[in-house]
Interface confidence: low
């Protein structure tokens, strides 16, 4: 399987909410001994390997934000801890999983990584990640709503997030 990031860049005004999204692609085993661990964390640019550094999102580690379930199952973080920090990660039946960040501030700007690990008998068989950038803007140049930019370089048209 692979992880796709539909959008590589999210540009949002301060105070807005944003949902960063990744999508699980390809065949997914549904055996009883196979589960998927999905999570989110921040990283930094200029690394040899993107997403190798794991930083917290609003002081919450990837541990705090993880989802752990079988194949294309729906799940979401029930942690009060995450919600107190204005965060919620979720996963649907179609392989999409996301993190929603509420009331954005300039400090939220940076590189975000989604991580998916396929686990068989508690052993990590396959680990993939996706990366995207969030830019939070303030002032007269800031957009009125979040604007997202598709990952494909052929897509030149901006898509406004709902």
């Amino acid at each position: 399987f692979k992880v796709a990031t539909p959008y590589s860049l999210y540009v949002c005004p301060e105070g807005q909410n944003v949902t960063l999204t990744c999508r699980l692609l390809g065949p997914v085993d549904k055996g009883h001994d196979v589960t998927f661990y999905k999570t989110w964390y921040r990283s930094s640019r200029g690394e040899v390997q993107t997403c190798s550094e794991r930083r917290p999102i609003r002081n919450l580690t990837f541990q705090d934000l993880h989802l752990h379930h079988g194949g294309h199952q729906a799940a979401n973080t029930s942690h009060d801890l995450a919600q107190r920090h204005g965060l919620e990660s979720a996963s649907d039946h179609h392989g999409n999983f996301s993190i929603t960040m509420r009331n954005l501030t300039l400090l939220d700007s940076g590189l975000y990584c989604c991580l998916v690990v396929e686990i068989r008998h508690h052993h990590s068989e396959h680990r993939v990640h996706g990366a995207m950038e969030l830019q939070v803007q303030t002032g007269k140049d800031a957009p009125s709503n979040c604007v997202v930019y598709p990952s494909s370089s052929q897509d030149s048209e901006n898509i406004t997030a709902a």
């Epitope: 661990y37 541990q63 705090d64 942690h79 690990v117 008998h121 052993h123 990590s124």
Partner: antibody
Framework: EVQLVESGGGLVKPGGSLRLSCAAS????????MNWVRQAPGKGLEWVSS????????YYADSVKGRFTISRDNAKNSLYLQMNSLRAEDTAVYYC??????????????WGQGTTVTVSS | DIQMTQSPSSLSASVGDRVTITCQAS??????LNWYQQKPGKAPKLLIY???NLETGVPSRFSGSGSGTDFTFTISSLQPEDIATYYC????????FGGGTKVEIK
């Protein structure tokens, strides 16, 4: 402050039992897999057992399989190691350690100070 | 079980020296290898994970490299506070530690 504190060690005769406890604080205990690692006097580190965050997955080293039982109580932020049929070679400092779960962990990043178990007649 | 062979078992070096420790796995473990530092009477401390990634807060004089079966841990410039025993540890899938390398100052 992220902290692990072990207790329950002591002197026990061969064939006896002990229950070690590890109290966790300063982090969301229920999100992490946990381990017991031991170190015999003057020797190296030996992994003993691990338990996943929700107790779904439990593993033991061959040297303790069938004699030791790992468990946890997430409501109490506590990890346990029940040690039965103790042998002289189980004499060691026992550490509990937090496993950074990826979910395949990339290391044990927080350790307790250790509790000493001595098995001797 | 995967065996980890660490060498040397002990070494003595001067302050400022470059120190290298090797660890060999009995079979391919990809990059599933960590390095720990243990000072006398203290609990181990994670220094490097996934063979080459420095744990947060660890000085940059520590580094790791390797993949497969052969791994290297390096202290680029030995400091007095680096006196300790260093352990490699694999996790593919269950943990085993190397025998340790005791580092002393000449």
């Amino acid at each position: 402050e992220v902290q692990l504190v072990e207790s329950g060690g002591g002197l026990v005769k061969p064939g006896g039992s002990l229950r070690l406890s590890c109290a966790a604080s300063g982090f969301t205990f229920s999100s992490y897999s946990m381990n017991w690692v031991r170190q015999a006097p003057g020797k190296g580190l030996e992994w003993v057992s691990s338990i996943s965050s929700s107790s779904s997955y439990i593993y033991y080293a061959d040297s303790v399989k069938g004699r030791f039982t790992i468990s946890r109580d997430n409501a109490k932020n506590s990890l346990y190691l029940q040690m039965n049929s103790l042998r002289a070679e189980d004499t060691a400092v026992y550490y509990c350690a937090r496993e950074v779960y990826d979910p395949h962990y990339y290391g044990m990043d927080v350790w307790g100070q250790g509790t000493t178990v001595t098995v001797s007649s | 079980d995967i065996q980890m062979t660490q060498s040397p078992s002990s070494l003595s070096a001067s302050v400022g020296d470059r120190v290298t420790i090797t660890c060999q796995a009995s079979q391919d473990i990809s990059n599933y290898l960590n390095w720990y530092q243990q000072k006398p009477g203290k609990a181990p401390k994670l220094l490097i994970y996934d063979a080459s990634n420095l744990e947060t807060g660890v000085p940059s004089r520590f580094s790791g490299s390797g993949s497969g079966t052969d791994f290297t841990f390096t202290i680029s410039s030995l400091q007095p506070e680096d006196i300790a025993t260093y352990y490699c540890q694999q996790y593919n899938p269950l943990p085993t530690f190397g025998g340790g390398t005791k580092v002393e100052i000449k």
